[in-house]
């Protein structure tokens, strides 16, 4: 039985060119975290392992920067960023937990209006 | 050959300190999580602490016996786990095992051969 | 906290009997989350099984384990004279975490 949840950062919206920081959060479980993956869709972004640290995929490497912590900092936003974004948490034993966040990649003058769901 | 060894167990006083160290090799150390666990005839296997990974954020927890008075840590570098003890009591005597846990696709738990900790005046 | 209680406290078995400890908890512990120890005089305790059924590297087939929510068992299809020892439940379902007083077995 999974008991543990995710909590996101749920919808978000950014300015084009600018940064934004994804993050999950696994909570209600004993469960150890072995493996975080960052997913866009069906591409994977980035990992971190308990063993081997961050791993960013060489297509990503230049507009993704780990952290913090388990987070993903994407920057240089494009509108082409615009879509759903997955936190995969691998647990033992419970298996996997899945978080989304639904990022919308504005031009400068309507990102002012969607400011409040930005992190801070 | 894994291995685990704790050094820093004695004769101590109550309310005095003592700091247990364990050194592990063997195995990949930065992903495994690490617990004390100890052991008296009067109390049988007590967890004391655990300490995770980096990637679960170093996060750790106490049993509730060792809470505000022990402190666990941990130094991938030198693959090594160390439990700070203060305000010890008469009842923290026993031996004090050091565990690592790790899950790679298969799930393993290495215990070491354990220290003894004796307070008494 | 979860409180293990475990079952007998010391037993003796002959040689190829059937073996049976149990392990009840005071509240609900996930499966994934209960684990075996076997422990002889003089060493530290060894895995013996972890999530509830699946036997640890190097235990023999004879053991098995099983069980759900607050009920819990190993069982020694045929006893051996190398299975006398204490066995002790642990769950870390939930914090803290805790030990079974343990089940000694003697070789009769």
């Known amino acids: 039985m999974m008991t543990g949840t995710i909590e996101t950062t749920g919808n978000i919206s950014a300015e084009k060119g600018g940064s934004i920081i994804l993050q999950c959060h696994l909570s209600s479980t004993t469960a150890q975290v072995t493996q975080v993956n960052w997913e866009q869709q069906d591409q994977l972004l980035a990992i971190c392992n308990a063993d081997l640290g961050w791993h960013i995929s060489p297509s990503f490497k230049d507009r993704v920067a780990p952290g913090p912590g388990l987070g993903l900092t994407l920057q240089s936003l494009t509108v082409n960023d615009t879509g759903e974004y997955f936190c995969i948490y691998h647990t033992y034993p419970d298996g996997t937990y899945t978080g989304r966040i639904f990022l919308e990649v504005l031009e400068s003058s309507v990102a002012e209006h969607g400011a409040r769901f930005q992190i801070p | 050959e894994v291995k685990l060894e704790e050094s820093g167990g004695g004769l101590v006083q109550p309310g005095g300190s003592m700091k247990l160290s364990c050194v592990a090799s063997g195995f990949t150390f930065s992903g495994a999580w690490m617990d004390w666990v100890r052991q008296s005839p009067e109390k049988g296997l007590e967890w004391v602490a655990e300490?995770?990974?980096?990637?679960?954020?170093?996060?750790?927890n106490y049993g509730e016996s060792v809470k505000g008075r022990f402190t666990i840590s941990r130094d991938d570098s030198k693959s090594s786990v160390y439990l700070q003890m203060n305000n010890l009591r008469a009842e923290d005597s026993g031996i004090y095992y050091c565990?690592?846990?790790?899950?790679?696709?298969?799930?393993?738990?290495?215990w070491g051969q354990g220290t003894t900790l004796t307070v008494s005046s | 906290q979860i409180v293990l209680t475990q079952s007998p406290a010391i037993m003796s078995a002959s040689p190829g009997e059937k073996v049976n400890l149990t392990c009840s908890a005071s509240?609900?512990?996930?499966?994934?989350?209960l684990y075996w120890y076997q422990q002889k005089p003089g060493s530290s305790p060894k895995l013996w099984i972890y999530g509830t059924s699946t036997l640890a590297s190097g235990v023999p087939a004879r053991f098995s384990g099983s069980g759900s929510g607050t009920s819990y068992s190993l069982t020694i299809s045929n006893m051996e004279a190398e299975d006398a020892a204490s066995y002790f439940c642990?769950?870390?379902?939930?914090?803290?975490?805790?030990f079974g007083g343990g089940t000694k077995l003697e070789m009769k």
């Open positions: 509240s609900s512990v996930s499966s994934g989350y």
């Open positions: 565990r690592g846990a790790l899950y790679d696709g298969f799930y393993f738990d290495y």
């Open positions: 300490i995770r990974t980096k990637v679960n954020n170093h996060a750790t």
């Open positions: 642990h769950q870390w379902s939930s914090f803290p975490y805790t």
